[in-house]
């Protein structure tokens, strides 16, 4: 059914400051991926820290810090002529607007590192 | 400061489904990081596809593919004894819950790629 | 029905490792992490680490000394507590418990019914 | 790690009593507070959480309240299947803690 041709796109200047969100989560069958273990086999490895705030929603999420400042060789060891880097993405949690009733929330914005990838240095030639 | 003792939890039966969410976003300085080159000069390259739906708040998300099954090597070359994957991470976005109007949504949980790491394969050793 | 089911009671020697097992059932496993909490004979409750099934991310108590290995198994739901160089002090109930990702206001509502671990020469 | 101090570690009383519990913070950077139940060779189970909030299917008598680094459990009026032994938890500072436990019991 086609929208209202009066009703304005969420990204425009007139769309509404409050709107109603339903928490009974929408789940796009997003769990049939299996864990991944890739944090341990990556060239560029790293570990899991745990940030939790309770008037966040969602309260607890896991973000990476890589593990060297170089990658990981085929024997194993960190070659620093390359680079272990983060890979960033930026999210929408809800965050509690007042601590008395857990009713009323506002969307921020958030930058977590999801995981590193080994990149290639920028190599800055001097003059 | 305390919340409310006559505050029922969001996961609570009696918490109410829908809660009021305002879309003043904090934390807008998120996008003052530059866009990174590293899906260029990773190891695990990979392209950023647009996925834009207009009934989904962000209505635009880009997302990764790996370029490559395996990584680049130090000559450039494909090297198929490592494997580049998609680094997966679940991200909520605000669904609308109706066509008609854009005041109503629902949070939907989704699984997006947002970048490529090397790593070493599984051997499976037959018996 | 959320339900944790963990694993049958183990008699250890001192020195040697114990895993125990926790099965979830009734929920999406990988929406919350799951904590285990220890219980020696007459005391109190002692929490020993978090793992989350969905990164494998995971945080200990340090006071377990890098002893204590958390792990989980998405394609089964369940979660395991490694346990390694046991001593007699390390003898108690082992649980394990849910804590909701999304909202952890909601922290350790269900628990499983305990495993209890006797480490004697 | 902050150490979660309750009192009275035991305590006897009768059917009908109001009894309160509390625990204390070896400092005050503590978020919240949640409350537990234990009976004999079961499980935990959750009373309060976040300080304040019954957890679902815990009857209106039991009530958490405090600030800071005390905090109290009330149970207004004391049924036959509230003795049990009861536990504080401290979050927001890791590891996160249980205070020592109040053995509540039959006068």
């Known amino acids: 059914m086609p929208r209202n041709p009066g009703c304005p796109n969420a990204e425009d200047k007139n769309f509404p400051q409050n709107v109603k969100v339903s928490l009974n989560i929408l789940n796009k069958s997003v769990n049939s991926r299996r864990p991944s273990d890739y944090y341990n086999r990556s060239t560029s490895p790293w570990t899991l820290h745990r940030n939790e705030d309770r008037e966040r929603y969602p309260s607890v999420i896991w973000e990476a810090k890589c593990r060297h400042l170089g990658c990981v060789n085929a024997e194993g060891n960190v070659d620093h002529h390359m680079n272990s880097v983060p890979i960033q993405q930026e999210i929408l949690v809800l965050r509690r607007e007042s601590q008395h009733c857990p009713h009323s929330f506002r969307l921020e914005k958030m930058l977590v590192a999801v995981g590193c990838t080994c990149v290639t240095p920028i190599i800055h030639h001097m003059a | 400061m305390p919340r409310n003792p006559g505050c029922p939890n969001a996961e609570d039966k009696n918490f109410p489904q829908n809660v009021k969410v305002s879309l003043n976003i904090l934390n807008k300085s998120v996008n003052s990081r530059r866009p990174s080159d590293y899906y260029n000069r990773s190891t695990s390259p990979w392209t950023l596809h647009r996925n834009e739906d207009r009934e989904r708040y962000p209505s635009v998300i880009w997302e990764a593919k790996c370029r490559h099954l395996g990584c680049v090597n130090a000559e450039g070359n494909v090297d198929h004894h490592m494997n580049s994957v998609p680094i997966q991470q679940e991200i909520l976005v605000l669904r609308r819950e109706s066509q008609h109007c854009p005041h109503s949504f629902r949070l939907e949980k989704m699984l997006v790629a947002v970048g490529c790491t090397c790593v070493t394969p599984i051997i499976h050793h037959m018996a | 029905e959320v339900q944790l089911v963990q694993s049958g009671a183990e008699v250890k020697k001192p020195g040697s490792s114990v895993k125990v097992s926790c099965k979830a059932s009734g929920y999406t496993f990988t929406d919350y992490e799951i904590h285990w909490v220890r219980q020696a004979p007459g005391q109190g409750l002692e929490w020993m680490g978090v793992n989350d099934p969905e990164s494998g991310g995971t945080f200990y108590n340090q006071k377990f000394d890098g002893r204590v290995t958390l792990t989980a198994d998405e394609s089964t739901s369940t979660a395991y507590m490694e346990l390694s160089s046991l001593r007699s002090e390390d003898t108690a109930v082992y649980y394990c418990t849910r804590y909701s990702k999304w909202d952890s206001f909601d922290g350790m509502d269900y628990w499983g019914q305990g495993t209890t671990v006797t480490v004697s020469s | 790690d902050i150490q979660m101090t309750q009192s009275p570690s035991s305590l006897s009383a009768s059917v009908g009593d109001r009894v309160t519990i509390t625990c204390r913070a070896s400092s005050g950077i503590i978020s919240y507070i949640d409350w537990f139940q234990q009976k004999p060779g079961k499980a935990p189970k959750r009373l309060i959480y976040?300080?304040?909030d019954l957890a679902s299917g815990v009857p209106s008598r039991f009530s958490g309240s405090g600030s800071g680094t005390d905090y109290t459990l009330t149970i207004s009026s004391l049924q036959p299947e509230d003795f049990a032994t009861y536990y504080c938890?401290?979050?927001?500072?890791?590891?996160?803690?249980f205070g020592q436990g109040t053995k509540l019991e039959i006068k």
């Open positions: 938890r401290q979050v927001g500072s890791y590891p996160e803690t």
């Open positions: 976040a300080t304040f």
